[in-house]
């Protein structure tokens, strides 16, 4: 795979972290969370051009048959290969109880 | 996250695994592999409606922040979420090897 | 399950600079949202805030005490430590860390280490 | 700084009875994002405190149901409505909306 960086469609247009800041309001959770107020959403967004962060030999592959049959098959994704934990405070039927959340924030990018 | 095939744009749009023919030669592999001589490439293909086959919680951040900022935030994006192992009998300097690859073929399917 | 644990020289002479360190457990500062504070008590008195560090290494000092104050943390030893110069008898306290959610939420305290200054 | 103001410093209650906790703000301790972050403590004789009410009025999980935290602004309650024995110890508000804070602590004991 090329370096993260290398984006042959200019710089920036890739696959790559962005921070997306949401209010609890934005995210549906207003009725849920107690804090934090707003999240600095880290997750992976930009194009996936030839072998670019190609995470596995599946991603290699489906770049192949996308330049063959780009109609049927989708160019591969740029979706998070890790991720940062996360707590939220949140309200339950029992009270106020601080929950850590593994999935939530995008670490590092690939392509899929 | 809805079920699998209750698919919101209509029987077998959204996220799910396809099965896509393709030769060594498709693949770019007619120089380093024996066989097979085709290979039957399971992959994800599909529209990632709200909410269905969410992956985790990053996956219904992002269908909350991609409602409200289309032209930002992308859909959430139909990948792996597991795959089977092949077998390729390959070409070595040595001669011929049998080579198990863990991630070539999708198994399933979810939206991130 | 969390755990903090205090840990200090006991005593100490006026003057000198006081080494406090929190071990702690059942969490990683490497969690966004989350810190750790340091808090203490003189005897028979009330909680005094001293300083914060958050997950991104900010930090938040008492401004009262800041010019002595100094935290920090080892991510990948699970410790935070807090450096107070020129201690007095008035520094004679029991001093607790505490794990912290955001603005406050000090769900987990540490028992406390004792630390007693000798003029 | 926020100075916060704990009265009374004494409160002796019978067993049954409620008893009410007043903490007032030197100022407004909404903070810039609209939470107010103003929590209670219990200190018991010879353990470290243990955070009772989040954000005012929310009870930690497990915190029984006869604590409850109200107020706004600068004006903040902690009522207890039928005190209990494992009640007694110091009682402390906190607030993180600007430089943190512990008001002075009351202690809730047996009359």
């Known amino acids: 795979a090329r370096n993260g960086d290398d984006c042959p469609l200019g710089p920036g247009r890739c696959c790559r972290l962005h921070t997306v800041r949401a209010s609890l309001e934005d995210l549906g959770w207003a009725d849920w969370v107690l804090s934090p107020r707003e999240v600095q959403v880290t997750m992976c967004i930009g194009a996936c051009p030839s072998q670019f962060r190609a995470a596995n030999m599946h991603a290699q592959i489906k770049t192949s048959l996308h330049r063959l049959k780009p109609d049927t098959v989708p160019a591969p994704c740029c979706v998070p290969a890790s991720y940062n934990p996360m707590v939220l405070i949140q309200k339950t039927d029992t009270g106020v109880s601080l929950q850590t959340y593994d999935d939530l924030l995008a670490k590092d990018c690939h392509c899929i | 996250a809805r079920n699998g095939d209750d698919c919101p744009l209509g029987p077998g749009r959204c996220c799910r695994l396809h099965t896509v023919r393709a030769s060594l030669e498709d693949l770019g592999w007619a120089d380093w592999v024996l066989s097979p001589r085709e290979v039957q490439v399971t992959m994800c293909i599909g529209a990632c409606p709200s909410q269905f086959r969410a992956a985790n919680m990053h996956a219904q951040i992002k269908t909350s922040l991609h409602r409200l900022k289309p032209d930002t935030v992308p859909a959430p994006c139909c990948v792996p979420a597991s795959y089977n192992p092949m077998v390729l009998i390959q070409k070595t300097d040595t001669g011929v090897s049998l080579q198990t690859y863990d991630d070539l073929l999708a198994k399933d399917c979810h939206c991130i | 399950q969390v755990t903090l644990k205090e840990s200090g020289p006991g005593i100490l002479q006026s003057s000198q600079t006081l080494s406090l360190t929190c071990s702690f457990s059942?969490?990683?500062?490497?969690?966004?949202?989350?810190?750790v504070s340091w808090i203490r008590q003189p005897s028979g008195k009330g909680l005094e805030w001293l300083a914060h560090i958050y997950w991104d290494d900010d930090k938040r000092y008492n401004p009262s005490l800041k010019s002595r104050l100094t935290i920090s943390k080892d991510t990948s030893r699970n410790q935070v430590f807090l450096k107070i110069t020129s201690v007095d008898t008035a520094d004679t306290a029991t001093y607790y860390c505490a794990r912290g959610g955001y603005d406050g939420y000090y769900d987990y305290w540490g028992q406390g280490t004792t630390l007693t200054v000798s003029s | 700084d926020v100075v916060m103001t704990q009265t009374p410093l004494s409160l002796p209650v019978s067993l049954g009875d409620q008893a009410s906790i007043s903490c007032r703000s030197s100022?407004?301790?909404?903070?810039?994002?609209?939470?107010?972050?103003l929590e209670w403590y219990l200190q018991k004789p010879g353990q470290s405190p243990k955070l009772l009410i989040y954000k005012v009025s929310n009870r930690l999980s497990g915190v029984p149901d006869r604590f409850s935290g109200s107020g706004s602004g600068t004006d903040f309650t902690l009522k207890i409505s039928r005190v209990e024995a494992e009640d007694l110890g110091v009682y402390y508000c906190f607030q993180g909306s600007h430089v943190r804070t512990f008001g002075g602590g009351t202690k809730l004991e047996i009359k």
């Open positions: 059942g969490f990683s500062l490497i969690t966004s949202g989350l810190g």
């Open positions: 100022q407004s301790i909404v903070h810039s994002n609209g939470n107010t972050n």
